[in-house]
């Protein structure tokens, strides 16, 4: 079995995480994707999740996560905006595959959020206006249920995670058509 | 129907094990984790862990480390709680709840509870 | 870990009024994505608990809606709008932000 392997980032309160977990094009583009964060015991819990099937390009915010999956690159785009102490933690990207369970993607993301002004570009990012917010009525709840397995048979392509800008081929250039996604209703 | 169905009351001397177990049915045993919790004679509710029937993987409390063990059985969808070295003070109504999938952490079913008496 | 405070610890109340629950949290219980972990559970007497709210706001299937969930980060409540005779038992407000999951130390409702 594969060790999971972990990436350490350190950052302020109110920067902005940014993931980007690599997979495999053919196999995956369309899959549901998610982001988990992974408690004690290897507990993880679906913090947010792309729509089913998921859409190119087209972002999908709950709360301070902002997911975007880019069919073309292959590639999930998760980012944490205004980050909080609270949010340190262990995360990582998983694919849905059912009726098989989750297909995990490297690296893990060790997240450790300190306190402290920071004047990096982008630490205020505010991508959370102009959102467009699906009605209170909405009954379905987005995430499927999951566990994950504790053994990894063979090593999906490494996540990479930054709190640069956006690279300029995937640069998101208008924050209008955010999805305001409810899990639950 | 979603259903938690627990073992029978226990009555133990101190110092020794008690194992219960909870036979879960109406859905997918491997999708949901479960939890362990415990509640003393008159007094509140107390998180003991948790185990993800699906890889099997467990999350004690500190309290509890060491003493306590949980495992799973897919074939039977049945968790068990082991509880060793008892004392007096364990005696209380021990029940296994299953965490919501999904989002939410919430303990949407519960079983209907097994007293474990410790007592010389 | 996150400890949990109820308040009061007795509630007597009167058919056809209303109720109100407070639980605090020693740490924020909202997460990244917006929910707040925070449930509220019924334990009638004798009985299992029962998941009345979760995420802090959200009703579980089958609680009348005389039930309500609110607050935010550290403070929440649990609001009864009239308190029905069937509704007397011990309320638990728990947080399940992190691993341990915590309990309040419970609100015993009955009626006077």
């Known amino acids: 079995a594969t060790k999971l392997t972990e990436e350490k980032y350190e950052l302020k309160e109110g920067q902005t995480l940014d993931v980007k977990c690599d997979y495999t094009l053919e196999k995956f583009a369309s899959s549901q994707k998610a982001w988990q964060i992974i408690r004690d015991g290897e507990m993880p819990k679906t913090l947010a999740c792309t729509e089913r099937p998921s859409k190119n390009s087209h972002p999908v915010q709950v709360g301070r996560i902002i997911l975007e999956d880019y069919h073309d690159h292959g590639l999930l785009r998760v980012r944490m905006v205004n980050l909080q102490v609270e949010d340190s933690g262990l995360y990582q990207c998983v694919i849905y595959q059912p009726p098989k369970e989750p297909h995990m993607l490297f690296d893990r993301i060790r997240l450790v959020v300190t306190k402290g002004f920071s004047g990096t570009p982008g630490s205020n990012e505010n991508s959370t206006q102009n959102v467009y917010k699906i009605p209170p009525t909405t009954t379905k709840a987005l995430c499927p249920l999951y566990t994950s397995p504790r053994t990894v048979t063979q090593a999906p392509p490494k996540s990479t995670a930054d709190v640069s800008t956006p690279d300029s081929e995937i640069n998101l250039t208008n924050v209008t058509d955010i999805i305001r996604v409810p899990v639950f209703n | 129907q979603v259903q938690l169905v627990q073992s029978g009351a226990e009555v133990k001397k101190p110092g020794a094990s008690v194992k219960v177990s909870c036979k879960a049915s109406?859905?997918?045993?491997?999708?949901?984790?479960m939890h362990w919790v415990r509640q003393a004679p008159g007094q509140g509710l107390e998180w003991m862990g948790v185990?993800?029937?699906?890889?099997?993987?467990?999350s004690y409390a500190q309290k509890f480390q060491g003493r306590v063990t949980m495992t799973r059985d897919t074939s039977t969808s049945t968790v068990y709680m082991e509880l060793s070295s008892l004392r007096s003070e364990d005696t209380a109504v021990y029940y296994c709840a299953r965490e919501a999938g999904q989002t939410s952490s919430a303990l949407d079913v519960w079983g209907q509870g097994t007293m474990v008496t410790v007592s010389s | 870990d996150i400890v949990m405070t109820q308040s009061p610890l007795s509630l007597p109340v009167t058919p056809g009024e209303p109720a109100s629950i407070s639980c605090r949290s020693s740490q924020s219980l909202l997460h990244s994505n917006g929910y707040n972990y925070l449930d509220w559970y019924l334990q009638k007497p004798g009985q299992s608990p029962q998941l009345l709210i979760y995420?802090?706001?959200h009703r579980a299937s089958g609680v009348p809606d005389r039930f309500s969930g609110s607050g935010s980060g550290t403070d929440f409540t649990l609001k009864i709008s009239r308190v029905e005779a069937e509704d007397v038992g011990v309320y638990y407000c728990?947080?399940?932000?992190?691993?341990?999951?915590?309990f309040g130390g419970g609100t015993k409702v009955e009626i006077k």
């Open positions: 995420l802090g706001s």
């Open positions: 728990m947080q399940g932000r992190q691993v341990p999951f915590t």
């Open positions: 109406g859905y997918t045993f491997t999708s949901y984790y």
């Open positions: 185990i993800n029937p699906g890889g099997g993987s467990t």
